[in-house]
């Protein structure tokens, strides 16, 4: 025998108090799948959490963080304090990147400058706490006998640290 509740679509619940008919989810609740016997309470984005997507009868609200903070955890369950570019967040708060490392974002860790010599290149622009070095042509290309200078390689785009 087929469960009559299986006919209830997302956005409704199977109401046992009304002969198992499909009733719409009450305000501030949702059901994202069919056949539900209850609707789930919508997440409320309060305080440091801002509403990124409003709750609907079929999907939960989604939150992000107010400026100065960024999301951590599944579904933005926490908001972590931003630092400035050129810093990283440590157990003792925001600290400047050590010499030879950089961070071009307000979150994540300081990473080592690119070692241009590993690719046989020279340093065209020195690195800073906020920016990676820019590697230029190899030293051989810069010798007086070289007929042409190859254009400098673009600075590598640092990967984003995982959220």
């Amino acid at each position: 025998l087929q469960d009559p509740c299986s006919n209830c679509p997302a956005g409704t619940f199977c109401d046992n108090n009304r002969n198992q008919i499909c009733s719409p989810c009450p305000p501030n609740s949702f059901s994202s799948a069919g056949g539900q016997r209850t609707c789930d309470i919508c997440r409320q984005c309060k305080g440091v959490f801002r509403t990124r997507k409003e709750c609907s009868s079929t999907s939960n609200a989604e939150c992000d963080c107010t400026p100065g903070f960024h999301c951590l955890g599944a579904g933005c369950s926490m908001c972590e304090q931003d630092c400035k570019q050129g810093q990283e967040l440590t157990k003792k708060g925001c600290k400047d990147c050590c010499f030879g490392t950089f961070n071009d974002q307000k979150r994540g860790i300081c990473r080592p400058w690119t070692n241009c010599s590993l690719d046989g290149k020279s340093v065209l622009v020195n690195g800073t706490k906020e920016r990676d070095v820019v590697c230029g042509p190899s030293p051989a290309d810069l010798s007086p006998g070289a007929s042409s200078v190859t254009p400098p390689a673009p600075a590598r785009e640092p990967g984003h640290s995982p959220q």
């Epitope: 305080g47 440091v48 959490f49 100065g68 903070f69 951590l72 369950s77 926490m78 908001c79 972590e80 304090q81 967040l89 157990k91 003792k92 708060g93």
Partner: nanobody, 124 residues
Framework: QVQLVESGGGLVQPGGSLRLSCSAS????????MSWVRQAPGKGLEWVSD????????FYEDSVKGRFTISRDNAKNTLYLQMNSLRAEDTAVYYC?????????????????WGQGTLVTVSS
């Protein structure tokens, strides 16, 4: 071990003021966000306010904005809640709570330590 001890509750008339304190020990207080949460008689827990680790970012439940002020003294390991223009509906047990990760504000479900609470009664 982590300890949070609230004080400052009591009976106050509508329109009056109270200042709650929460004395913290057993962890590096200055590295953690803190919160006030309340529970009215017969009701569920309600988030009231958050403050970040340094005290420069504060957040409030809509119903207390402009009336309550959260603050902290990291040198004294103490969290405060200044409550002005109190109303009957502010009657509740007020709890202070610690957030689980350094320099991070979590949702109420994730707070890892709570005080025992202090009762605030607003009545004429």
């Amino acid at each position: 071990q982590v300890q949070l001890v609230e004080s400052g509750g009591g009976l106050v008339q509508p329109g009056g003021s109270l200042r709650l304190s929460c004395s913290a020990s057993g962890f590096t207080f200055s590295s953690y966000a803190m919160s006030w949460v309340r529970q009215a008689p017969g009701k569920g827990l309600e988030w009231v306010s958050d403050i970040n680790s340094g005290g420069e970012s504060t957040f409030y439940e809509d119903s207390v904005k402009g009336r309550f002020t959260i603050s902290r003294d990291n040198a004294k390991n103490t969290l405060y809640l200044q409550m002005n223009s109190l109303r009957a509906e502010d009657t509740a047990v007020y709890y202070c709570a610690k957030h689980p990760l350094t320099y991070t504000i979590a949702t109420m479900n994730d707070y890892d330590y709570w005080g025992q609470g202090t009762l605030v009664t607003v009545s004429s």
